[in-house]
Every structure is written in structure tokens, then in C-alpha cells.
Interface confidence: medium
């Protein structure tokens, strides 16, 4: 079996996690992609996903999560803005490829969010001069209901009722139409 590797990010409340997941261009460019959280002993929960088929560099926003799929570069950009301590956890990017199980992209991301104003860009409103505007047309894409049992971290759930739908995600409050976000973190 492939060893599951993790990358750890330690950020302060209010900062932005800004990471990318690489994928094989030819194979997955237009495939639907998702950002998931993995809780111990549970199936991965899908927090946000791109449209189906995935649109090139078209931002999809779900609460404080913004996904952008750069087809020409084989990367999915994932941002979680205004981080909260409760956002700490293990995350992964996956590619939906029905009828097969989702394909997991490496590495997983171990996010540690700690309290306290960091004073670093991403933590407040003047973090960057370029204002990133979420287009008003940005919609919440419908995400498939299935997840992969291969990514369970401990025991699998007792029944399929534990598999989350997009509406039973962790609580991510909505942000305003204008979000100032850093580029590198």
C-alpha cells in the first residue's frame, strides 16, 4: 500500500491556508475535485468541490473555502480564509472518477490553527493590496455523496449514515464578497 504522507502547517487564527494539490494533467484536467477533512475513525467529509466537469481557473466558494482548478498547470488551489482553531485537522484533495473510488492526491495536510492575533498578512483586512473578488456567479457545486473507505484513519463508520452530505459539513461561516487573501500561505 502507498504510504500516506502528511505536511504540517501551523497558522494563527485569522490567517489563510493557501495550498495546492498537483494532479496528472492529461488524466484529470476536467475531473471534479474535492477538498475533504478526515476525522479519526470517520469517513472523509467533503467540504467543497469543483463543478462537474471542473471549469478552468473558475473559483468555487463554499463558506470560507475557495477552490480554483488550473487545468493548464495540473493544480488545484485550495484556500481556507479566516482560519479558526476548530479548523485544525487532517485534510486531503481528491479527484472524483465515478464509478471508481475517488483518487487521493498527495500529500495530506495537517493543519494546526492556534489562537492569537498573528500580525502576519492573511490575519487581517490589510493583508494584501490586491483585493481578491469572488465573482457573484460563484456557486456551491454539488458534491458526490460517496467517499473512499481507503482513507479511513481508524475504524470505519458503523453505517452509511455516517457518510456526510454537503449540508452536514463542519460549520464554515460565510465570508463577504470581497476577501483579502495572501498568496503564499
Amino acid at each position: 500500500a502507498t504510504k500516506l504522507t502528511e505536511e504540517k502547517y501551523e497558522l494563527k487564527e485569522g490567517q489563510t491556508l493557501d495550498v495546492k494539490c498537483d494532479y496528472t494533467l492529461e488524466k484529470f484536467a476536467s475531473s471534479q475535485k474535492a477538498w475533504q477533512i478526515i476525522r479519526d475513525g470517520e469517513m472523509p467529509k467533503t467540504l467543497a468541490c469543483t463543478e462537474r466537469p471542473s471549469k478552468n481557473s473558475h473559483p468555487v466558494q463554499v463558506g470560507r473555502i475557495i477552490l480554483e482548478d488550473y487545468h493548464d498547470h495540473g493544480l488545484l488551489r485550495v484556500r481556507m480564509v479566516n482560519l479558526q482553531v476548530e479548523d485544525s485537522g487532517l485534510y486531503q484533495c481528491v479527484i472524483y472518477q465515478p464509478p471508481k473510488e475517488p483518487h487521493m492526491l498527495f500529500d495530506r495536510i495537517r493543519l494546526v490553527v492556534t489562537k492569537g492575533f498573528s500580525g502576519t498578512p492573511g490575519s487581517n483586512e490589510n493583508s494584501t493590496q490586491n483585493v481578491y473578488k469572488i465573482p457573484p456567479t460563484t456557486t456551491k457545486a454539488l458534491c458526490p455523496l460517496y467517499t473512499s473507505p481507503r482513507t479511513v484513519t481508524q475504524a470505519p463508520p458503523k453505517s452509511t449514515a455516517d457518510v456526510s452530505t454537503p449540508d452536514s459539513e463542519i460549520n464554515l461561516t460565510n465570508v463577504t464578497d470581497i476577501i483579502r487573501v495572501p498568496v503564499f500561505n
Epitope: 501551523e10 495550498v19 500529500d107 503564499f184
Partner: antibody, heavy 127, light 107 residues
Framework: QVQLVQSGAEVKKPGSSVKVSCKAS????????ISWVRQAPGQGLEWMGG????????NYAQKFQGRVTIAADEPTSTTYMELRSLRSEDTAVYYC????????????????????WGQGTTVTVSS | DIQMTQSPTSLSASVGDRVTITCRAS??????LAWYQQKPEKAPKSLIY???SLQSGVPSRFSGSGSGTDFTLTISSLQPEDFATYYC?????????FGQGTRLEIK
Amino acid sequence: QVQLVQSGAEVKKPGSSVKVSCKASGGTFNRHAISWVRQAPGQGLEWMGGIIPLFGTANYAQKFQGRVTIAADEPTSTTYMELRSLRSEDTAVYYCASSYFYGSGSSNYYYYGLDVWGQGTTVTVSS
Amino acid sequence: DIQMTQSPTSLSASVGDRVTITCRASQGISSWLAWYQQKPEKAPKSLIYAASSLQSGVPSRFSGSGSGTDFTLTISSLQPEDFATYYCQQYNSYPITFGQGTRLEIK
């Protein structure tokens, strides 16, 4: 691997602006993040800001916020750093540096550390 | 901002010596740390990224270790060309910050 070539030395008056360019060659321009770092005479390194050309948005250190603009021109693979309202303490060597952030199996982070540096541009601010 | 503190600030050593430079972050930065070497009138050169990964083309006598807040750069056997100033740098979060530098001189 990408190479970075910077524009030549500049002598400026206090209150004026300077625009330094950094041209990349030998790599895919928008697969890198470009940072600007300065070093005053006899001092250490100070990060000013950076840009990922693919995404277009720049980010700046709070100290330089409102006084610096970093921009990228993809067709010419060139990044620019403009510093306004110059004062004598801005006298320094200004470096651009590239961070490779793309590739299968690489880090999820965009920013790796500054793996390739330009030769530096000396900016002297004097009346 | 994350403060990076290097020690010592200067160091005298001889060719063949084993040298260790430490860098401490004011808060946890996982493994998001890089080390650079700079010689007078030259641009810095990247030695180590992600705390312990050697940049391509850098001699294996250079090594890095640590995670969280405490990091170390080790030169196992000093060569004449290694006398320079060394900087650590964090890139866990903005603003990216450097240590104040460690000047390595010939004894």
C-alpha cells in the same frame, strides 16, 4: 532551472521612486513564485514581498505596505518591484529570488524557500 | 511576526572542523525553514529547504535538522570555501522572516 537577471544600479533622490526589473529565463515563468529581498549595507536580509505570476496577486511585508508594488508581466517573464517615497535608509542591494512551487510529488506549499537569486541591484538614495 | 534568532552571531573555526549553527523561531513553524550562505558582494545561495532537504548541487557536508521551533545547520568538515555568513529563514507564515545571520570566520 530558472535564471534571474536584474536591471542595473540606480541612484535616486529622496522622495522619488525606483523600479527594478527581474527577468526570468530557462524555466516556466508562472510555475515560480518571485520574492523581493533587500539588504542594507552591512545588514541582514529583509523580505519585502512576493508574487506568483500564475495567480497575479502580490503580497507585501507590513513594513512596505502602501509603498511597494510588485507586478509580473507573463509575456516577457519579467517581475517588477517599485518602491516609492524613497528615503536614505532605502539604500540597499535589492534581490529578486525564485521559489519553485509546482510539480507532482512536491510540497503542497507554494513557497519553498528562495532557491534561485538574481545578481542584485544596488539602489542608492542620496540628495 | 515570527522572530528568528540565530546563534552564535559569529564563529571562528578551522578547516576540517565540525560546525553547528542554531536557529530558533518565536513560534512553531513545522519544518518550513531554509538555510542560506552568503559571501561578500554576492547574492545568497540556498543550501537547505524544508529544514533538512539539501538543495541540488550543495555538498553533502551541509545538513539541516529540527522542526517546530529549534533548528540546526551542521557543516561536518569545514572547507576553505565555507567561510561566509549563514542565514536561516522561516516560510511557515507571512511575513517571511530571516535570522540576523551567523558570520563564520577562519580561526
